[in-house]
Amino acid sequence: CKAMHVAQPAVVLASSRGIASFVCEYASPGKATEVRVTVLRQADSQVTEVCAATYMMGNELTFLDDSICTGTSSGNQVNLTIQGLRAMDTGLYICKVELMYPPPYYLGIGNGTQIYVIDPEPCPDSDF
């Protein structure tokens, strides 16, 4: 297993609809044809997997159908979008990148993106 640098933004604010997007960029030392990207959430010293995708260079990311994540790839950049976020989902979202094929296997883990989610205020009742 060889190390690889992964860069991601420090902070992202989710939209009022609970959608957050950020770029995960990796310094590929070789010409990988298969890449696996995993988003991890760290909160209260616990790490959980949010979603994972495998893709071929030049192809779309393959997330499971029930995933809250979508994404696109361009070169060594992955544009990730996480949907359905609520205030309780605020936390550090870490991008993990694995170059699966061809060998050697490379692994890179970013420093994380702090995603802040603010639940929208309910609309006040209106009198007409």
């Epitope: 298969e34 495998t54 893709y55 071929m56 192809n59 779309e60 393959t62 699966m100 094929y101």
Partner: nanobody, 113 residues
Framework: EVQLLESGGGLVQPGGSLRLSCAAS????????MAWYRQAPGKEREVVAG????????NYGDSVKGRFTISRDNSKNTLYLQMNSLRAEDTAVYYC??????WGQGTLVTVSS
């Protein structure tokens, strides 16, 4: 048990065509990006073509663009590779791939007159 069973290889003359098939079983075929790789004698395995789960996105290695077409039928759990205008340098063992987990055993394609 996971199986990727390639078929359709054989001997063909330069300029000819072949259609490879890969029958998948033992896993959820429609959940995987699929690909064809090939390995010529004495060379590294290289990607030929890839296709997304739905079949809506495809990509090709530079050496086969415009000649090869990858497709899939999720209802039949089958991956295909239509190879046209074959050249001697296309001679190789062709492998079916469920990215990034499973490999087939390969089928030999020989292009020779």
């Amino acid at each position: 048990e996971v199986q990727l069973l390639e078929s359709g290889g054989g001997l063909v003359q330069p300029g000819g065509s072949l259609r490879l098939s890969c029958a998948a079983s033992g896993f959820t075929f429609s959940s995987y990006t699929m690909a064809w790789y090939r390995q010529a004698p004495g060379k590294e395995r290289e990607v030929v073509a890839g296709i997304s789960r739905s079949g809506g996105t495809t990509n090709y290695g530079d050496s086969v663009k415009g000649r090869f077409t990858i497709s899939r039928d999720n209802s039949k759990n089958t991956l295909y590779l239509q190879m046209n205008s074959l050249r001697a340098e296309d001679t190789a063992v062709y492998y079916c791939r469920a990215v990034s987990d499973y490999w087939g055993q390969g089928t030999l394609v020989t292009v020779s007159s």
